[in-house]
Amino acid sequence: MAVTACQGLGFVVSLIGIAGIIAATCMDQWSTQDLYNNPVTAVFNYQGLWRSCVRESSGFTECRGYFTLLGLPAMLQAVRALMIVGIVLGAIGLLVSIFALKCIRIGSMEDSAKANMTLTSGIMFIVSGLCAIAGVSVFANMLVTNFWMSTANMYTGMGGMVQTVQTRYTFGAALFVGWVAGGLTLIGGVMMCIACRGLAPEETNYKAVSYHASGHSVAYKPGGFKASTGFGSNTKNKKIYDGGARTEDEVQSYPSKHDYV
């Protein structure tokens, strides 16, 4: 039950995280015009990964896409790449984890396969979250650098083409959304990996050998628990608490009426 809950929660947390990463990637407010200690403007500038926008005091908002690919800073391209990789990995991870969910039965899929898929999706979520956090952090670092450069009257816009001395940019809402979303995806991935350990079936072979002491009906079963080698082992699902203590593999064991588990 705890494993199912951990897996389900990991899935939901990762889902929210990936939705957040997608939202952050699409948002226009990665950097916003710094209003502190600046002249009061009738124009509010903000920029995203794909376009830059202006909100006029008249109420109108106009955005302009970065129609050049080669003219953009390499760092911006790197951030785009990291966010896209994060989204792609996260999306694949979600797809895999849906089939890995313990509460969903697909044909005769064994727990070992589900454990493998859970681990795979968990790793994908972890990498996805790390990509998002890295992307947002690179952009934030770029902003900090440009902020001080612009203070020295050297700042050019994210497009890198037009000299606009008066506009300094600071952290936008998308950065915080990205950090939180990346963190959630990372946490979700860790939870999936933890759930995977619980999903991996433990090879518990109760090989029923009866020793009948005279006058006593005491069953002694050697062997105990065989430690599972993990989610990669070829262990099959063992029915342990069967009336006759038979495993699916050992249909030819002959229990006596004195055998207890």
Epitope: A42, V43, S52, E56, S58
Partner: antibody, heavy 117, light 113 residues
């Protein structure tokens, strides 16, 4: 047809108060950023104040603390409350709508405010 | 405050001739967000309120004759009337629409030579 009609101007003594109104027809003033611009006799245009969405207001430094821009959405009217009036406030006051590019596209005919003893 | 300086203060041009009015701002009016210049040109005839001619430095207002054109970027802007008509005689103002206060130029009076 969009029309802006200013009223409330007149002769007032220095230190006195006046409230200018700008009534809109064919336009819902509350949905637009609005401005007051003045023009002293024989002089150029001077922006005085603006009110934008959310009721955020901006003022020319020389009128800050003396003038207050506001609007009554129910009456579809823009106001400019002027107090502690000075001789240099004498001008024709226009109300205008801010549009694309923060440019003022619709203007009223203006109302004359004369501050004199 | 941003200072808008128009030149010349007055301009006498023959009908059918080209008229050019310049406007210089003390700070760049170019927005990095949309690459537009926040400068507007107005025409004011005696006894009338101003009329918007050009906004975003070069975008002509609908209904304005195409003999009016605006150009320039950053701090230097120009209003050009390609072929002066009698009805174009007026005072022309440029306005900064980027920074508060939204300052106007001192005006250029256009007259017939």
């Amino acid at each position: 047809e969009v029309q802006l009609v200013e009223s409330g101007g007149g002769l007032v003594q220095p230190g006195g108060s006046l409230r200018l109104s700008c009534a809109g027809s064919g336009i819902t003033l509350s949905t637009y950023a609005m401005s007051w611009v003045r023009q002293a006799p024989g002089k150029g245009l001077e922006w005085v104040s603006s009110i934008i969405s959310g009721g955020i207001t901006y003022y020319l430094d020389s009128v800050k603390g003396r003038f207050t821009i506001s609007r009554d959405n129910a009456k579809n009217t823009l106001y400019l409350q002027m107090s502690s009036l000075r001789a240099e406030d004498t001008a024709v006051y226009y109300c205008a709508r801010k549009y694309h590019g923060n440019a003022l596209d619709y203007w009223g005919q203006g109302t004359l405010v004369t501050v004199s003893s | 405050d941003i200072v808008m300086t128009q030149s010349p203060d007055s301009l006498a041009v023959s009908l059918g001739e080209r008229a050019t009015i310049n406007c210089k701002s003390s700070q760049s009016l170019l927005s990095s967000g949309n690459q537009r210049n926040y400068l507007t040109w107005y025409q004011q005839k005696p006894g009338q309120p101003p009329k918007k001619l050009i906004y975003w430095a070069s975008t002509r207002e609908s209904g304005v004759p195409d003999r009016f054109s605006g150009s320039g970027s950053g701090t230097d802007f120009t209003l050009t009337i390609s072929s002066l008509q009698a009805e174009d005689l007026a005072v022309y103002y440029c306005q900064n629409n980027y920074f508060y206060p939204l300052t106007f130029g001192q005006g250029t009076k256009l007259e017939i030579k």
